[in-house]
């Protein structure tokens, strides 16, 4: 790397992946191993994030970009940039302070995360229950009883279930 020659700040010419080394007369030096600078003109390189414990490396650190972590099997990411990992549960369960618990009757969870949610109330839309709900699945609403008179043909599609509840990420 050559010494920069900017009249204003000699460090401004140091590209990403380098730092302006005051100990070497403001020469642009490459970031040391396990560190990075994502923008130019940096006077230091930042230490890379370390994916340890429950975290595993999703993307290795490079001289210009930080490492990215995700969670080991059995856990899913929470927080900005996956700063925490939360235990997975089975479908039909929700996570409580005492661990994974089955959904109560009348509720379901079709994911490994989030909370159990009430079955859709078909009667609110004037429909009837076509398929009963389970711990893992919402009910399927069918045509209203009036629509089941002789001659009625097509089955109306089920009312869309509410958005699944996601843990913050």
């Amino acid at each position: 790397f050559e010494r920069t020659r900017s009249l204003q700040d000699p460090c401004s010419n140091c590209p990403a992946g380098t730092f302006c080394d005051n100990n070497r007369n403001q020469i642009c030096s490459p970031c040391p191993p396990n560190s990075f600078s994502s923008a130019g003109g940096q006077r230091t390189c930042d230490i890379c994030r370390q994916c340890k414990g429950v975290f595993r490396t999703r993307k290795e650190c490079s001289s210009t970009s930080n490492a990215e972590c995700d969670c080991t099997p059995g856990f899913h990411c929470l927080g900005a940039g996956c700063s925490m990992c939360e235990q997975d549960c089975k479908q039909g369960q929700e996570l409580t302070k005492k661990g994974c618990k089955d959904c109560c009757f009348g509720t379901f969870n079709d994911q490994k995360r989030g909370i159990c949610r009430p079955w859709t109330n078909c009667s609110l839309d004037g429909k009837s229950v076509l398929v009963n709900g389970t711990k893992e699945r919402d009910v399927v609403c069918g045509p209203s009883p009036a629509d089941l008179s002789p001659g009625a043909s097509s089955v109306t599609p089920p009312a869309p279930a509410r958005e699944p509840g996601h843990s913050p990420q």
Epitope: I47, M84, C85
Partner: antibody, heavy 124, light 106 residues
Framework: EVQLVESGGGLVQPGGSLRLSCAAS??????????VAWIRQAPGKGLEWVSS????????YYADSVKGRFTISRDNSKNTLYLQLNSLRAEDTAVYYC???????????????WGQGTLVTVSS | DIQLTQSPSSLSASVGDRVTITCQAS??????LAWYQQKPGKAPKLLIY???NRATGIPSRFSGSGSGTDFTLTISSLQPEDFATYYC????????FGQGTKVEIK
């Protein structure tokens, strides 16, 4: 309920060795992702992280001050964590705590569970 | 390595006071910061994790904020049982603790 109980501390001469144990209950040390650590506190001083071992892949980590002298390990069958202390120095005198990462069902790089500590005194 | 600098190193306060302790990291650590309380002869106790999440059973008077390099622990109304030493800790790269802040009775 998560519990950590340390033992093995005592008086040892400079240059000597000691093995600390931490018996874990309420969780499995071999569970993927559950990291455990040793953290020490010299008399009247602050907390200093010493060493960690991850539950996933058994990767080990050491503070520069103990690297090459201390060894962290675990016995999954006994659900016990160990710290082997060799070439001990006066500055290693401290209460040594065993701690588990995370809290409840959320894991991360913090310590939600701590043992009561065991005192190591290095003196001639 | 990443250094954490706590300030003040000690403070005197009265019951009912609002107390603020700061922790500055030597580089950006996003939200990889926790706060602990330690009383003499006892093990540290987790108060806050991921910069702002209160640990289970911790009273709401304790709150954490900040991201990047500057973090704050606030006790909104100091109680008699809150006189202790408080530590910040980062887990972004390895693990390091701040030097501690002792909260004493005025």
């Amino acid at each position: 309920e998560v519990q950590l109980v340390e033992s093995g501390g005592g008086l040892v001469q400079p240059g000597g060795s000691l093995r600390l144990s931490c018996a874990a209950s309420g969780f499995s040390l071999s569970t993927g992702g559950v990291g455990v650590a040793w953290i020490r506190q010299a008399p009247g001083k602050g907390l200093e992280w010493v060493s960690s071992i991850s539950g996933y892949g058994s990767t080990t980590y050491y503070a520069d001050s103990v690297k090459g002298r201390f060894t962290i390990s675990r016995d999954n069958s006994k659900n016990t964590l160990y710290l082997q202390l060799n070439s001990l120095r006066a500055e290693d005198t401290a209460v040594y705590y065993c701690a588990r990462e995370g809290s409840d069902a959320v894991l991360g790089d913090w310590f939600g569970y701590w043992g009561q500590g065991t005192l190591v005194t290095v003196s001639s | 390595d990443i250094q954490l600098t706590q300030s003040p190193s000690s403070l005197s306060a009265s019951v009912g006071d609002r107390v603020t302790i700061t922790c500055q990291a030597s580089q950006d650590i996003t939200t990889y910061l926790a706060w602990y309380q330690q009383k003499p002869g006892k093990a540290p106790k987790l108060l806050i994790y991921d910069a702002s999440n209160r640990a289970t059973g911790i009273p709401s008077r304790f709150s954490g904020s900040g991201s990047g390099t500057d973090f704050t622990l606030t006790i909104s109304s100091l109680q008699p049982e809150d006189f202790a030493t408080y530590y910040c800790q980062q887990g972004y790269y390895l693990w390091t603790f701040g030097q501690g802040t002792k909260v004493e009775i005025k």
